[in-house]
Structures are given as C-alpha cells and as structure tokens.
Interface confidence: medium
Amino acid sequence: MMTGTIETTGNISAKKGGSVILQCHLSSTMAQVTQVNWEQHDHSLLAIRNAELGWHIYPAFKDRVAPGPGLGLTLQSLTMNDTGEYFCTYHTYPDGTYRGRIFLEVLESSVAEHSARFQIP
C-alpha cells in the first residue's frame, strides 16, 4: 500500500539568465528511495539520482544542470524555453513509484522574484 506523499516547490518563477532549484520531498512513508528521475515537460530526462550509483546528468543538459541540493536539481542559465512542467519521479521499495509536478515560469523581467514554496500537488 502506498502511503507516501510528494511535496514539491509547486509553481515557481525565475528570471531569464538566472537559476532555480527544483525540489521534491517524499514523506509519510518508510519506503526506501532507490532512485529519483527528473524529467522535463517533453518527458526528456534531465537527470537521475540513484541512491547507490550516484548522479547522472544527461549530456544535453550537462552545461546547465547541477545536481542537488539533496535529491533536488538546480537549473542554470535559464531561457524562456525552460518554461513548463518538470516532474520528479521517486522509485521506491517496496511502495513503487511516486511522482511530483513543478511548474516553472521563466520571466523576462529583471524584477522577477524567485518564488518557491512547498506544496502537495
């Protein structure tokens, strides 16, 4: 039985050229997190954090994606094309798979505030 819930940073905004942290947190379960996959809106994999084998950043994103903090992901040198949905998928044992959603809006405005809050999607 899957008892856990994924908390995410929800809807966030950041300015073009800046950076943003994508964070998910799995709670309310004793399941062991084996792997976290980070996907972009078009379902392409950005990165994988395997509990045993470590981080793997996919080649297309190597220059703009940094692992962490924790199981999260830092996107750098943001462009307008980065606007969209991001998904964290937690593969756990024995529960199975949990999935969280974050919506990132990249703003042209230099006064764009980086806003982030944890919420349950």
Epitope: Q32, Q35, N37, E39, N50, E52, L53, H56, H91, P94
Partner: antibody, heavy 127, light 107 residues
Framework: EVQLVESGGGLVQPGGSLRLSCAAS????????MSWVRQAPGKGLEWVAN????????YYVDSVKGRFTISRDNAKNSLYLQMNSLRAEDTAVYYC????????????????????WGQGTLVTVSS | EIVLTQSPATLSLSPGERATLSCRAS??????LAWYQQKPGQAPRLLIY???KRATGIPARFSGSGSGTDFTLTISSLEPEDFAVYYC?????????FGGGTKVEIK
C-alpha cells in the same frame, strides 16, 4: 558502510559438498537481491547464482543447476551457497555480491548491477 | 546465453595514453551493460552501469558508450592505478554473463 564477508571455503574432494556463507552488514539486507560470482585461478569472472530480496526467485548458471542452491536468511543478514557434487572445475574464488538497482524509465524495468562485493573465499576441489 | 567478447585480450600502453576497450554481445543487450575493474588479489569494482553512466566516485577519465551489441570503455588518459583487468557484464537477462576481460598493462 556496506560490508560483505564470505566464509566456508576450503579443500574438498570431487563429489563432496561445501556450504558458503556471506555475512552482510551496513544496509537493509532484506531490501536487496544478492548474487554469487566466481573466478577460477587466473581466469575471468563467472556469475553463478542470484536470489531476489525475499528469496522467491532464484537463478543459476547452467553448469551448476541441480548441484548448487542459493538461499538467504533475512533475519540473520546472511546469504548462502550450498554446493553439492563438486567438480574440479568448480575450483575458484567465490564472491558474494550485492545488487544496486537502476530504474530504466524508457523501458519501465529495473536493472541490477553489482556495486558491492566481498573479498571472496577460495574453494578448491581436488583429490 | 548471451556471449560477450572483449577485445583486445591485452592492451600495452604507457601512462598518459588513451585506452579503448571493446565489448561485443552475441545479441542485443540494449543498454544493460556494466564495466568492472579488477586488480590482482582484489574484488571487482563497478565503473560504468547502463553502458554509459559512471558509478559513484569513478573519475571522469572513465567513460562508456554503445548500445545493442557494441560497447566501448574509454580511459582518456591512463593513470598508474588504471593498469588492471577490465570486464564487461550484461544484465539484460539471466544467465548474467561477463566478457573474458581485457588486461591493460604498462608498456
């Protein structure tokens, strides 16, 4: 820190039996698949057997089927290999290896790699 | 059974040189291939998993590539501690199999 310590190796005559043990520590033993891998003197690696987390599924290389039995005791954090009808060609260092799981989202399946190994125990089958 | 053939059997190189090791599978293993390093008297060490991903703590000079039946392990610039035997292993299906190994020795 993950630790795997094999024991039970030694000299045995052809046709004899031996039981190898692997004591695991530093991780939740019941959450991981385990394998035995062997290496004959001066030769390459050969996977021998695999057992799932709860012991429900077991796999063997053809050359040991019907002679070797892999088992585990999750309460004791231990893995075993019962070896019967031993042959000269079973002479090798036997390693206990723990699986690390990788999820391939493009194919929706888990892959199992051996990231943690013991230091091995030598089994010599000779008359 | 999937047979893995490694070549060359022995590679004689000097420190600082580039090493290219090959592993060929008798049938497709997709990307389910690992590379291990083994030194005399020691257990194998996982270097690469899923054909191209470096395991935790493995230096960037080690890289893997390929999919299907043809795979390559590249060591961009050999360090003295890299001289060892390297094995590929497929985890696509049982029985799991290893290649025969490639020994990288000092020239």
């Amino acid at each position: 820190e993950v630790q795997l310590v094999e024991s039970g190796g030694g000299l045995v005559q052809p046709g004899g039996s031996l039981r190898l043990s692997c004591a695991a520590s530093g991780f939740t033993f019941s959450s991981y698949g385990m394998s035995w891998v062997r290496q004959a003197p001066g030769k390459g690696l050969e996977w021998v057997a695999n057992i799932k987390q709860d012991g429900s599924e077991k796999y063997y290389v053809d050359s040991v089927k019907g002679r070797f039995t892999i088992s585990r005791d999750n309460a004791k954090n231990s893995l075993y290999l019962q070896m019967n009808s031993l042959r000269a060609e079973d002479t090798a260092v036997y390693y206990c290896a723990r699986v690390s799981y990788y999820y391939d989202s493009s194919k929706l399946r888990w892959a199992e790699y051996f990231q943690h190994w013991g230091q091995g125990t030598l089994v010599t089958v000779s008359s | 059974e999937i047979v893995l053939t490694q070549s060359p059997a022995t590679l004689s190189l000097s420190p600082g040189e580039r090493a290219t090791l090959s592993c060929r599978a008798s049938q497709s293993v997709s990307s389910y291939l690992a590379w291990y390093q083994q030194k005399p008297g020691q257990a194998p060490r996982l270097l690469i998993y899923d054909a191209s991903k470096r395991a935790t703590g493995i230096p960037a000079r080690f890289s893997g590539s390929g999919s299907g039946t043809d795979f390559t392990l590249t060591i961009s610039s050999l360090e003295p501690e890299d001289f060892a035997v390297y094995y590929c292993q497929q985890v696509h299906n049982f029985p799991l199999t290893f290649g025969g190994g490639t020994k990288v020795e000092i020239k």
